[in-house]
Interface confidence: low
């Protein structure tokens, strides 16, 4: 048993049929010595008396909020949560496996630049009685500080008969140099509690590997004289690291007609302009990627030819 | 420690092309190592990230763009003195700081070159003949060093009398290649910055 936060405790259980469970001793947080009784959750049934209560925790029915009272007055609470271990593996029932980039990927993270700020997200089909707490650091032994906000519900999607919920959190490394060469990974730890079930999830990564720039901005077309051609120009996204001559991007330029018979045209360039033949109803799209370290491409920025 | 804005004239910076070749070569070599050594811990997640230049050179700090010198997290107190002569410095405007930067890059390349050559000599003795260093990568390191053209003491190739542990050598190769790829990215960024200034 260990303390998750004040008055909240996690009991680690080997989860198999007829498992003996864990013996837990609860102590009432009071100077009182006599006349103390214990109850569980909303029940008025007295489980025991005295300053301590010894219980055998085997299943979820044994978890919950234990309260010690004296003469009708509440003295203190202890909330017991269960963390299940099945066949030596901690349970992962609360979050959905996103399976990318590999199986058992529950947390996914992205950064728009090298500033040390990143966003992580995860999925669940659970809609109620659910809380998350996020901690992060650079390295695990002698960790350096990373500050994370509160996890928030960021999207809901219908998946067949089920609803799927996406939660996300923003974190910022306390003292980050965009030009630094990372040798210690960022560690992200998410505590998840659903009703009386506790689980924890971790992810480890280098910022350089989770970079995904925002799309190029100010994508514009300029007709060229006496020609069906246009000059397409765009700029680095505002969120990308500066100076741009040091943190350079490469771009993918795509031309797409409306008719299914028309082929897509696509080129890669380090420049921020290109010349394109614009057919009626076609559109031009551009996306960006770090020029030197191939992490993710940005989403597309698009403009219609008309 | 930083790069000032006053740097070589456009088109006067012969190191950019070499640094681009270097990144391509080390990336290809790393990819080859990952594939060939698929049953060894050779991915970024599996290896220990070591920097053989740590406390010997300070390329990131010496080559910091001017715009990042306001960021206290980027300013490291390590001081290293470098020789200040080089043919990539093709303009009288070149500053002392830029010379420090380029000589630091040269020292990095020299250290990695020695490590790779020593390692290749060991790998050539492996009866499995599983992997060798790409001669193109070694040639590209040499080309960039020549373009930088710093006068520097020759570092003797390390030799070992004991029987090489080929498993350890291959793991060390992976560690070196990962670190060298990261340094090659920094070098490419620096050359791009200098070329644009």
């Amino acid at each position: 048993i260990w303390e998750l936060k004040k008055d909240v405790y996690v009991v680690e259980l080997d989860w198999y049929p007829d498992a003996p469970g864990e013996m837990v001793v609860l102590t009432c947080d009071t100077p009182e010595e006599d006349g103390i009784t214990w109850t569980l959750d909303q029940s008025s049934e007295v489980l025991g008396s005295g300053k301590t209560l010894t219980i055998q925790v085997k299943e979820f029915g044994d978890a919950g909020q234990y309260t010690c009272h004296k003469g009708g007055e509440v003295l203190s609470h202890s909330l017991l949560l269960l963390h299940k271990k099945e066949d030596g593996i901690w349970s992962t029932d609360i979050l959905k496996d996103q399976k990318e980039p590999k199986n058992k990927t529950f947390l996914r993270c992205e950064a728009k630049n090298y500033s040390g700020r990143f966003t992580c997200w995860w999925l669940t089909t659970i809609s109620t009685d659910l809380t998350f707490s996020v901690k992060s650091s650079r390295g695990s032994s002698d960790p350096q500080g990373v500050t994370c906000g509160a996890a928030t519900l960021s999207a809901e999607r219908v998946r067949g008969d089920n609803k799927e919920y996406e939660y996300s959190v923003e974190c910022q490394e306390d003292s980050a140099c965009p030009a630094a060469e990372e040798s210690l990974p960022i560690e992200v730890m998410v505590d998840a509690v659903h009703k009386l079930k506790y689980e924890n999830y971790t992810s480890s990564f280098f910022i350089r590997d989770i970079i995904k720039p925002d799309p190029p901005k100010n994508l514009q077309l300029k007709p060229l004289k006496n020609s069906r051609q246009v000059e397409v120009s765009w700029e680095y996204p505002d969120t990308w690291s500066t100076p741009h001559s040091y943190f350079s991007l490469t771009f993918c330029v795509q031309v797409q007609g409306k008719s299914k018979r028309e082929k897509k045209d696509r080129v890669f360039t380090d420049k921020t302009s290109a010349t394109v033949i614009c057919r009626k109803n076609a559109s031009i799209s551009v996306r960006a990627q770090d020029r030197y370290y191939s992490s993710s491409w940005s989403e597309w920025a698009s403009v219609p030819c008309s | 420690r930083n790069l000032p804005v006053a740097t070589p004239d456009p088109g006067m910076f012969p190191c950019l092309h070499h640094s681009q070749n270097l990144l391509r070569a080390v990336s290809n070599m790393l990819q080859k190592a990952r594939q060939t050594l698929e049953f060894y811990p050779c991915t970024s997640e599996e290896i220990d990230h070591e920097d053989i230049t740590k406390d010997k050179t300070s390329t990131v700090e010496a080559c910091l763009p001017l715009e990042l010198t306001k960021n206290e997290s980027c300013l490291n107190s390590r001081e290293t003195s470098f020789i200040t002569n080089g043919s990539c410095l093709a303009s009288r405007k070149t500053s002392f700081m830029m010379a420090l930067c380029l000589s630091s890059i040269y020292e990095d390349l020299k250290m990695y070159q020695v490590e790779f050559k020593t390692m290749n000599a060991k790998l050539l003795m492996d009866p499995k003949r599983q992997i060798f260093l790409d001669q193109n990568m070694l040639a590209v390191i040499d080309e960039l060093m020549q373009a930088l053209n710093f006068n520097s003491e020759t570092v003797p190739q390390k030799s070992s009398l004991e029987e090489p542990d080929f498993y350890k050598t291959k793991i060390k190769l992976c560690i070196l290649l990962h670190a060298f790829r990261i340094r090659a990215v920094t070098i490419d960024r620096v050359m791009s910055y200098l070329n644009a200034s």
């Epitope: 399976k99 990318e100 795509q254 299914k260 897509k264 993710s296 491409w297 989403e299 | -």
Partner: nanobody, 125 residues
Amino acid sequence: EVQLVESGGGSVQVGGSLRLSCVASGRTFNMYVMGWFRQAPGKEREFVAAISGEGLISDYRDSVKGRFTISRDNAKNTMYLQMNSLKPEDTAVYHCAAGQWTNGPFTRERTYEYWGQGTQVTVSS
């Protein structure tokens, strides 16, 4: 949940043609990006071609460009892969895939949530 069923595979001589089909269950077919991937014995699964929800945007691996054409008929909940000028190196099990979240590159496996069982294509000389 989307079920995907491929058909149209078979054996063909070098230079020959095949047309693969992939039928999807469900009523929102046009909300899914669709792709063809292939896996040769002892090799990794690799991207072949992909197409957007309305069929306006598509992409191909370099080795099949100009020989393969991906298309879809949303009214029939069906995607096609027309394969011409087939080569021995095209021999593989071809899988169709569907993905509803389109923020992943559609040439990458991670974009796709649903996969068919596959259809065998054998090209002999």
